[in-house]
Amino acid sequence: AELFLIASPSHPTEGSPVTLTCKMPFLQSSDAQFQFCFFRDTRALGPGWSSSPKLQIAAMWKEDTGSYWCEAQTMASKVLRSRRSQINVHRVPVADVSLETQPPGGQVMEGDRLVLICSVAMGTGDITFLWYKGAVGLNLQSKTQRSLTAEYEIPSVRESDAEQYYCVAENGYGPSPSGLVSITVRIPVSRPILMLRAPRAQAAVEDVLELHCEALRGSPPILYWFYHEDITLGSRSAPSGGGASFNLSLTEEHSGNYSCEANNGLGAQRSEAVTLNFTVPTGARSNHLTS
């Protein structure tokens, strides 16, 4: 009797199952008690000898490519051997690499966690994922795994992490890059500093007093509010960051405490109060102010 090994499918793709069947065209396996064994190259597969003429392989990989055959043994210990069948496992090259962020949209608060998720729409086998910072290509990390996605995590984002990123995936057929993704790091405003600027060392009534408020850190745009004794004087915007100024024509009522507040939508911070006092120098005819 002749023995044949049939693989279904005969040209499997990596990760897919294959069924091996040991066939005897001119002999019904029910006619006699047979034991079957399947081999790749020189190694027995699965459970070894079994009464089933089929062997199910759950997932085939590139390294499973090889020469397969089966053997059948009768109760009388006569062993039949099939011819060898070459099974080539086909690897699917990576395609359509994309990079996504968590949180979505690439906007992240300073100190928060950022995850760069690299995905491929297609690709089998071990895929190596690499992450790069900036179009200049600073290599951050590489991971090799049998999955279509991989993650790179920045546990606590810093201002210096604001950059363009991309990832590359490859599985032996050449690397494929994702598109560039821009990361914006949103920074809450720091406590602003209020400075009072007068045209002379001792400001006098009717002088123009400049109140300059500046938060040294914080993502733009920043809105500044100016206060005199907790009464709002007005607001100024700094669309590109930096400070803002508010001008005040002085009267005697303008002595007292001044402060400012910075707000960029990520939180508000109030400056320390700056006190402006009138002094009446000896022999002077006009009131003066000092801060």
Epitope: L130, G137, P175, P177
Partner: antibody
Framework: QVQLQESGPGLVKPSQTLSLTCTVS??????????WSWIRQHPGKGLEWIGY???????YYNPSLKSRVTISEDTSKNQFSLKLSSVTAADSAVYYC???????????WGQGTLVTVSS | DIQMTQSPSSVSTSVGDRVTITCRAS??????LAWYQQKPGKAPKLLIY???SLQSGVPSRFSGSGSGTDFTLTISSLQPEDFATYYC?????????FGQGTKVEIK
């Protein structure tokens, strides 16, 4: 500033193996993110990428040349090498070594070396 | 392989002129395009990467634009040292491939 310098024979006989070495100075070939490449340019023609080596020995070759190309590295000398077997007159070209940044563009090049295949 | 087609293949122009070179990819390459300048007997020199980013040390008269399949290199005001051959190169799909070159000559 990274500099690359090609070296090797300028004349190779047909059917023999072309061998070139690229010496890198000002940076390590072991540093991550870079792929150390060979590119050639036939006289008066365009540029053709041959292959590269990265990650301490992993290689990729142009499918059109794959059967004849071997790229290797010697990290102790900070060098990488090209071997092209069974050369013909069609392999006569200026051969450049170059640094590929993150698989996307070539930012540093050697000055090139002219190789002529002739008996 | 992705084919990169440059046009024109050569252009005769004068110092001070604005020069535009185009590069078309046979399929989409996102923004993975670089431009190089090559002078006779010299190695290519990187000018632009990621379609529009200017390489450090390259004069600002060089600029790049485009994404997908159509890309442009512009020299805003040609200088005597800019007469050379220019190549585009894609890196979106393996293997990396170059355009056939555009020669910028003196009129």
């Amino acid at each position: 500033q990274v500099q690359l310098q090609e070296s090797g024979p300028g004349l190779v006989k047909p059917s023999q193996t072309l061998s070139l070495t690229c010496t890198v100075s000002g940076g390590s070939i072991s540093s991550g993110g870079y792929h150390w490449s060979w590119i050639r340019q036939h006289p008066g023609k365009g540029l053709e990428w041959i292959g590269y080596i990265y990650n301490s020995g992993s290689t990729y070759y142009n499918p059109s040349l794959k059967s004849r190309v071997t790229i290797s590295e010697d990290t102790s000398k900070n060098q990488f090498s090209l071997k092209l077997s069974s050369v013909t007159a069609a392999d006569s070209a200026v051969y450049y070594c170059a640094r590929l940044v993150g698989v996307t563009y070539f930012d540093c090049w050697g000055q090139g070396t002219l190789v002529t295949v002739s008996s | 392989d992705i084919q990169m087609t440059q046009s024109p293949s050569s252009v005769s122009t004068s110092v001070g002129d604005r020069v535009t070179i185009t590069c078309r990819a046979s399929q989409g390459i996102r923004s993975w395009l670089a431009w190089y300048q090559q002078k006779p007997g010299k190695a290519p020199k990187l000018l632009i990467y990621a379609a529009s980013s200017l390489q450090s040390g390259v004069p600002s008269r060089f600029s790049g634009s485009g994404s997908g399949t159509d890309f442009t290199l512009t020299i805003s005001s040609l200088q005597p040292e800019d007469f050379a051959t220019y190549y585009c190169q894609q890196a979106n799909s393996f293997p990396p491939t170059f355009g056939q070159g555009t020669k910028v000559e003196i009129k």
